[in-house]
């Protein structure tokens, strides 16, 4: 059995040239004639040179999975899905996203170091000593309150709580 060159496909014991992206095989090659190709029908595509008898169905962006259509399908390119605002892609296969997850909310004691995007989760960072954060979408940790000369420090601040000063 012959091994076909790249961008050829095997038909019986003959190698036929593949069809261009956006096309599929309508009629395989013969002794004196090459491969006859046909354009992909609407809502189908082929992204590469191929020996397919049918084009591939275009992907559908499922809103229930947190997806929206970013780029419509064309005869040579699959639909490109993106996550809705506030979500990032958990499963990325090339340019195709199948599931989205909600951006992480930074816990108390951490701040947002890098905001989440459609393809990356939020990156959180610990507050430095002397600062605190209640978490959420805070991008800066706040410095602990310095109790005034007329106040007494009841409880020292932590990375998630401010200093508690006496009211006297």
């Amino acid at each position: 059995q012959p091994s076909c060159r790249q961008e050829e496909f095997l038909v019986g014991d003959e190698c036929c040239p593949m069809c261009n992206p956006g096309y599929h095989v309508k009629q395989v090659c013969s002794e004196h004639t090459g491969t006859v190709c046909a354009p992909c029908p609407p809502q189908t595509y082929t992204a590469h040179a191929n020996g397919l008898s049918k084009c591939l169905p275009c992907g559908v962006c499922d809103p229930d999975m947190g997806l929206l259509t970013w780029q419509e399908c064309s005869s040579w390119k699959d639909t490109v899905c993106r996550c809705i605002p506030g979500y990032f892609c958990e499963n990325q296969d090339g340019s195709h996203c199948s599931t989205c997850l909600q951006h992480t909310t930074c816990p108390p004691g951490q701040r947002v170091e890098k905001r989440g995007t459609h393809d990356q989760d939020t990156v959180c960072a610990d507050c430095l000593t002397g600062t605190f954060s209640l978490g959420g979408t805070q991008e800066e940790c706040l410095p602990w309150t310095n109790c005034s000369a007329f106040q007494q420090e009841v409880r020292r601040g932590t990375n998630s709580t401010d200093t508690t000063c006496s009211s006297q």
Epitope: Y23, C29, H32, T33, G34, C37
Partner: antibody, heavy 121, light 108 residues
Framework: EVQLLESGGGLVQPGGSLRLSCAAS????????MSWVRQAPGKGLEWVSL????????YYADSVKGRFTISHDNSKNTLYLQMNSLRAEDTAVYYC??????????????WGQGTLVTVSS | EIVLTQSPGTLSLSPGERATLSCRAS??????LAWYQQKPGQAPRLLIY???TLSSGIPDRFSGSGSGTDFTLTISRLEPEDFAVYYC??????????FGQGTKVEIK
């Protein structure tokens, strides 16, 4: 004698229309795939369109899709190319050619002498 | 689409010399490549199909070789009537049918 004879070329304004004809003789027209191939002045060959003997399969180059229409009349042994919305870049000698192998994926074994189409204002 | 690149653009030779013309495809077209000859003011004429099969009535000083992406047209001994423009055409995967930009064989 086996031959192809084109006619219908001429000067036309941009946006105008023209209909080319190709009369075949000496062979059975109704059993051959027929094509139009053009050649801009001083340039190379560019395939334009092809029709199957039954007329059910028609193919077009992207550059003419939606503007040109290929057809034939087997009883008159004649191939046609209706050209609408003509542009300056459509200026060329248009050849009628017979396909060998009866498929779009074949070669051209018989050519007409060509007819000149000039698109200019 | 499959792009065909012919080289050289012009070939200057004397009658009796050997001419070697090249045609390279942007991807494999198998053996489905044809060569045409065109003289000034005339229509093209089919010389070779299936990369190496001589069309009827074509003298055997013309020969073709190659497969996949690299093809060659050879004229073993140039006759005065062979000075012309030569085009390659792929029909491995259509539509579209594509031609090379041509090689001019001129008298040196």
């Amino acid at each position: 004698e086996v031959q192809l004879l084109e006619s219908g070329g001429g000067l036309v304004q941009p946006g105008g229309s023209l209909r080319l004809s190709c009369a075949a003789s000496g062979f059975t027209f109704s059993t051959n795939y027929m094509s139009w191939v053009r050649q801009a002045p001083g340039k190379g060959l560019e395939w334009v369109s092809l029709i199957s003997y039954s007329g059910s399969n028609k193919y077009y180059a992207d550059s003419v899709k939606g503007r040109f229409t290929i057809s034939h009349d087997n009883s008159k042994n004649t191939l046609y190319l209706q050209m609408n919305s003509l542009r300056a870049e459509d200026t060329a000698v248009y050849y009628c050619a017979r396909g060998r192998g009866n498929t779009i994926s074949g070669t051209f074994d018989l050519w007409g002498q060509g007819t000149l189409v000039t698109v200019s204002s | 689409e499959i792009v065909l690149t012919q080289s050289p653009g012009t070939l200057s030779l004397s009658p009796g010399e050997r001419a070697t013309l090249s045609c390279r495809a942007s991807r494999s077209v198998g053996k489905y490549l044809a060569w045409y000859q065109q003289k000034p003011g005339q229509a093209p004429r089919l010389l070779i199909y299936s990369a190496s099969t001589l069309s009827s009535g074509i003298p055997d000083r013309f020969s073709g070789s190659g497969s996949g992406t690299d093809f060659t047209l050879t004229i073993s001994r140039l006759e005065p009537e062979d000075f012309a423009v030569y085009y390659c055409q792929q029909y491995g995967s259509s539509p579209p049918i594509t031609f090379g930009q041509g090689t001019k064989v001129e008298i040196k």
